[in-house]
Interface confidence: low
């Protein structure tokens, strides 16, 4: 007996073929014995079966001895042995239909998790290999799970669905709602702009919902919103703002928030979380802010750094065109009577500035001068 | 100055073994991720190889298997390592660097010429 | 593997005029992860456009791009001399992450 593969939802056409080349009597019936379609002369006849406005077949071909049975928007119940009666030769086909559906939802927040069910005929022992746009290979049953959602996650899914050595392949679009990043780090120097970018890693047509950020300062005991915005349709508009720092947030994506001026006691982390409309669960984007510092103040030139600098990070002091005079793994360095001359503060990852300030050390009869 | 030089290109015969390399300077290399293009004279460009800053690798089925992509972080390198080499590999290998927070190769080296044939 | 189509092959204009360069994939993609990029003769390619509309860093904003889904567009507003080279786009929505095979941009 043939097995055919088929998709709810789709066309498929089973094949009956007689030894003539030329138009005869055929009849196509289910396994209960009734009949679906056949014909009488030229034209196409059809039986009172459930597939009657969705059975058809191809009477160019019946000049050739060709028979074929199409049946269109298939359905699970549609699975079952169909006979082609020819040239009192009877033809098998036995036809399973399957569908894979997303348990919700096909948008999905990042780290959320990911159910493919797959529908199949009973009787039917199908495998399921699913894979992921990067190329992750998933295997399963009638359930196939996938936790913990990643950004690149996103895209087409291919499930193949095997039974009888047969398979059929499905294509499900899946959008992992995230940030492009989890985490971005800002380096400035005491008193420059501060750009924060939050860019979302997918597009839709309409993007509903409300965000807030919330910042740990390094000096302060305990976190506080800095800001809380609304999203209509992709456009952003500001709910409440502190009043220091006083952040200002561009009205369209990606979400941007600027702080006027980075400061010692604004470096910290923050925390931007994104809660969309009829979805649970919220995005989240953390960003970091590390605030460098060169003063003088008598005969103490002193470089520090305020903020989430890792271990490695190595903070220097040197004098233009020279080896560095001090270096070290720690936030805050100085030279005790700095020679005159232009002196940079580097704070370094492996040996590529992160970030620089500079500071001109005038004799010692003048007063210090930052550029 | 952000800049990525390749170099170890060169003539090599069918079957052989190659590797290329990266050298980034002016950015804070394991933040980004890095990726191999290659052009043949006169075509367009191929993607060949990409390493997330996870160590995450990915390639082409036309390479999958031949070559393999490597990064070391304390050197601020991207390797290449290219075996099997076929004549249909011959072309500009140029490493370009991956967007910090979008998708899109920001940074472009110069490109080292790899040509194999016997 | 998603395809990336890019039509016309060549497209002759003069300094002054509008460009406007497509670029197809033979499935959708998130426009996050379509990007475009210019190469003049002789030097590395440039990126031009991320996020299929973003323009990168330094470039001019004659350069803009547009579209979702399969259907994505480059435009040039009014071409200067140096506008004239090939333009690619690429895809990241699957691995591999395929380029098209570029629209020459020359001068009538």
């Known amino acids: 007996k043939k097995v055919v593969l088929g998709k709810k939802g789709d066309t498929v056409e089973l094949t009956c073929t007689a030894s003539q080349k030329k138009s005869i009597q055929f009849h196509w019936k289910n396994s209960n014995q009734i009949k679906i379609l056949g014909n009488q002369g030229s034209f196409l006849t059809k039986g009172p079966s459930k597939l009657n406005d969705r059975a058809d077949s191809r009477r160019s071909l019946w000049d050739q001895g060709n028979f074929p049975l199409i049946i269109k928007n298939l359905k699970i119940e549609d699975s079952d042995t169909y006979i082609c009666e020819v040239e009192d030769q009877k033809e098998e086909v036995q036809l399973l239909v399957f569908g894979l559906t997303a348990n919700s939802d096909t948008h999905l927040l990042q780290g959320q998790s990911l159910t493919l069910t797959l529908e199949s005929p009973p009787g039917s022992s199908p495998s399921v290999q699913c894979r992921s746009p990067r190329g992750k290979n998933i295997q399963g049953g009638k359930t196939l799970s996938v936790s913990q959602l990643e950004l690149q996650d996103s895209g087409t899914w291919t499930c193949t669905v095997l039974q009888n050595q047969k398979k059929v392949e499905f294509k499900i679009d899946i959008v992992v709602l995230a940030f492009q990043k989890a985490s971005s780090i800002v380096y400035k120097k005491e008193g420059e702009q501060v750009e924060f970018s939050f860019p979302l890693a997918f597009t839709v047509e309409k993007l509903t919902g409300s965000g807030e950020l919330w910042w740990q300062a390094e000096r302060a005991s305990s976190s506080k919103s800095w800001i809380t915005f609304d999203l209509k349709n992709k456009e952003v508009s500001v709910k409440r703002v502190t009043q220091d720092p006083k952040l200002q947030m561009g009205k369209k994506l990606p979400l941007h928030l600027t702080l006027p001026q980075a400061l010692p006691q604004y470096a910290g982390s923050g925390n931007l979380t994104l809660a969309l409309e009829a979805k649970t669960g919220k995005l989240h984007q953390e960003v970091n802010l590390v605030v460098m510092r060169a003063t003088q103040l008598q005969k103490n030139l002193t470089c520090e750094v305020w903020g989430p600098t890792s271990p490695k990070l190595m903070l220097s002091l040197k004098l233009e065109n020279k080896e560095a005079k001090v270096s070290k793994r720690e936030k805050a360095v100085w030279v005790l009577n700095p020679e005159a001359g232009m002196w940079q503060c580097l704070l370094s990852d492996s040996g590529q500035v992160l970030l620089e300030s500079n500071i001109k050390v005038l004799p010692t009869w003048s007063t210090p001068v930052q550029p | 100055e952000v800049q990525l030089v390749e170099s170890g290109g060169g003539l090599v015969q069918p079957g052989g073994s190659l590797r290329l390399s990266c050298a980034a300077s002016g950015f804070t290399f394991s933040n980004y991720d890095v990726h191999w293009v290659r052009q043949p004279t006169g075509k367009g460009l191929e993607w060949v190889s990409t390493?997330?800053?996870?160590?995450?690798?990915y390639y082409p089925g036309s390479v999958k298997g031949r070559f393999t992509i490597s990064r070391e972080n304390a050197k601020n390198s991207l390797y290449l390592q290219m075996n099997s080499l076929r004549a249909g590999d011959t072309a500009v290998y140029y490493c370009?660097?991956?967007?910090?927070?979008?998708?899109?190769?920001?940074?472009w080296g110069q490109g080292t010429t790899v040509t194999v044939s016997s | 593997e998603i395809v990336l189509t890019q039509s016309p092959g060549t497209l002759s204009l003069s300094p002054g005029e509008r460009a406007t360069l497509s670029c197809r994939a033979s499935q959708s993609v998130s426009s996050t992860y379509l990007a475009w990029y210019q190469q003049k003769p002789g030097q590395a390619p440039r990126l031009l456009i991320f996020g299929a509309s973003s323009r990168a860093t330094g470039i001019p904003d004659r350069f803009s791009g547009s579209g979702s889904g399969t259907d994505f567009t480059l435009t040039i507003s009014r071409l200067e001399p140096e506008d004239f080279a090939v333009y690619y786009c690429?895809?990241?929505?699957?691995?591999?992450?395929?380029f098209g095979p570029g629209t020459k941009v020359d001068i009538k």
């Open positions: 370009a660097r991956g967007g910090y927070d979008y998708y899109g190769l920001d940074v």
């Open positions: 690429q895809q990241y929505g699957s691995s591999p992450f395929t």
């Open positions: 390493i997330g800053t996870a160590g995450d690798t």
